[in-house]
Interface confidence: low
Amino acid sequence: QLTTESMPFNVAEGKEVLLLVHNLPQQLFGYSWYKGERVDGNRQIVGYAIGTQQATPGPANSGRETIYPNASLLIQNVTQNDTGFYTLQVIKSDLVNEEATGQFHVYPELPKPSISSNNSNPVEDKDAVAFTCEPETQDTTYLWWINNQSLPVSPRLQLSNGNRTLTLLSVTRNDTGPYECEIQNPVSANRSDPVTLNVTYGPDTPTISPSDTYYRPGANLSLSCYAASNPPAQYSWLINGTFQQSTQELFIPNITVNNSGSYTCHANNSVTGCNRTTVKTIIVTELSPVVAKPQIKASKTTVTGDKDSVNLTCSTNDTGISIRWFFKNQSLPSSERMKLSQGNTTLSINPVKREDAGTYWCEVFNPISKNQSDPIMLNVNYNALPQENGLSPG
């Protein structure tokens, strides 16, 4: 059976296509090609006579067609108008005609697309943005890429207009992009230049750094405020509710206790019209904000009841602190045999009794901090064991 095959079936505009003929009968007078699905003299492209090997152009000939002795037809520099069906008629020697129809599709070489946007400066959580891939062309697939990734599944992303339009519902600061669109047809593909969004947002709640609360007199106070914001936030400082200055940093040299108080950073975004504040308490004091762990020592850790005495000493390098003592979670002294001396650094027990055996520890503190020692174990016995002079806690 006579058949035709288009090579290729999908042709790029400006390229060529060969209508190849298979199973051509023997004993031929000639053949003709027609545009369309049937033989129509008004739409003849070319005729070919075997005897004379002469090709004769028909009414539908454009000058771009070449017919070969094997009946194949080459069409060069194809246009989209060439898309469609082509019919070959073979005139046999017995004057019985055979026909075969083939087709091909011409697609344009796609241009580099571009992205248009209805809003390139959206406000976070408020605006929607619609991107449109230009130009609109027939028989084209539209694809979108965000940050070089295919579109994530998200209820905030919607495709419409045959995927030519990508809408971001309620943009966030993470939606900056870049965005690219790609157009594809069976013969070509092209991707746009990337487009980024300038998402306006913030300010978020500001952060004041450093995080320190306590400062010593004479130190320099240097505070910095930051709030995520686009465009960048404008900052101002208030101390105890009184406006100080409109800067991101606040610097006060050689502070005194009078500089203690409440420090407020105010962040403002003039585009979104939003404001956020953070308050930080600063305390200027001679007292150590962190009291070191004290050390506890005993003159003896094993003593004879009703005979020996013992001295417990609480050591610390911190100044301006107070000391208190504990025995079995009770505050000391708890009897007349216990005496505190040297600003409570020493606890003396004289004489030691059976009920004094157990765990002792000391605690150092000031108005803003405290710390306690590791416990020490006091052993009391009533037989004549040798005394142990030791400093190690139990």
């Epitope: 697939t141 965000i146 940050n147 990734q149 295919s150 594809q184 047809n185 593909a189």
Partner: antibody, heavy 120, light 113 residues
């Protein structure tokens, strides 16, 4: 209901060729990226190839690059895998898969597979 | 290319107990544009094709029981079966779904102890 039906598997000698087909139904075929994934007997899953909605973009695992060609005919709702220069290590169950949504993504729908055996 | 490493290779857990499978990728799967991790988990029972359980590292596919959960970010991910059922015996695979390469982990076989 999404359905993917692979065919074309069989026994082939090393160096030979085979063409797998995957007939799709139950969804708009031309809207989705499609893939081939294979699994050697008793082994794990291996992604083989990806093709974009229009067929203009393809990508391949290094192990098959230059030997296998993925293609599609949107008018026939069919995905193909042309396998040339086959090797013993290509012996596997070949699955046709579809993404959950139109772009390239995870594999939400799988066919039952077609077995390819490369042996002399 | 991204390499996905799963551990352990196999796991035996009593019915009703928790099963935990780990997956590590050779590069971050976190997409900073949308703060989503491009990782999926699949379940494959003998003689069947794989079934999608979880995508974006922690989003359950519709119809998947809530005893399956995914967690992790960047390069380290975990699939947890909170209370193992008999029908959960299968091989589990993690997969990077960053276009254009879709690499699978080597698989973890989960059995009943």
């Amino acid at each position: 209901e999404v359905q993917l039906l692979e065919s074309g598997g069989g026994l082939v000698q090393p160096g030979g060729s085979l063409r797998l087909s995957c007939a799709a139904s139950g969804f708009s075929f031309s809207d989705y990226y499609l893939y081939w994934v294979r699994q050697a007997p008793g082994k794990g899953l291996e992604w083989v190839a990806t093709i974009s909605v229009g067929g203009g973009q393809t990508s391949y695992a290094d192990s098959v690059k230059g030997r296998f060609t993925i293609s599609r005919d949107n008018s026939k709702n069919t995905l193909y895998l042309q396998m040339n220069s086959l090797r013993a290590e290509d012996t596997a169950m070949y699955y046709c898969t579809r993404a959950l949504y139109y772009g390239p993504a995870w594999f939400a729908y799988w066919g039952q597979g077609t077995l390819v055996t490369v042996s002399s | 290319d991204i390499v996905m490493t799963q551990s352990p290779d196999s796991l035996a857990v009593s019915l009703g107990e928790r099963a935990t499978i780990n997956c590590k990728s050779s590069q971050s799967l976190l997409n900073s544009a949308n703060q989503k991790n491009y990782l999926a988990w699949y379940q494959q029972k003998p003689g069947q094709p794989p079934k999608l359980l979880i995508y974006f590292a922690s989003t359950r596919e519709s119809g998947v029981p809530d005893r399956f959960s995914g967690s992790g970010s960047g390069t380290d991910f975990t699939l947890t079966i909170s209370s193992l059922q008999a029908e959960d015996v299968a091989v589990y695979y993690c997969q990077s779904h960053i276009y254009p390469n879709f690499t699978f982990g080597g698989g973890t076989k989960v059995e009943i102890k």
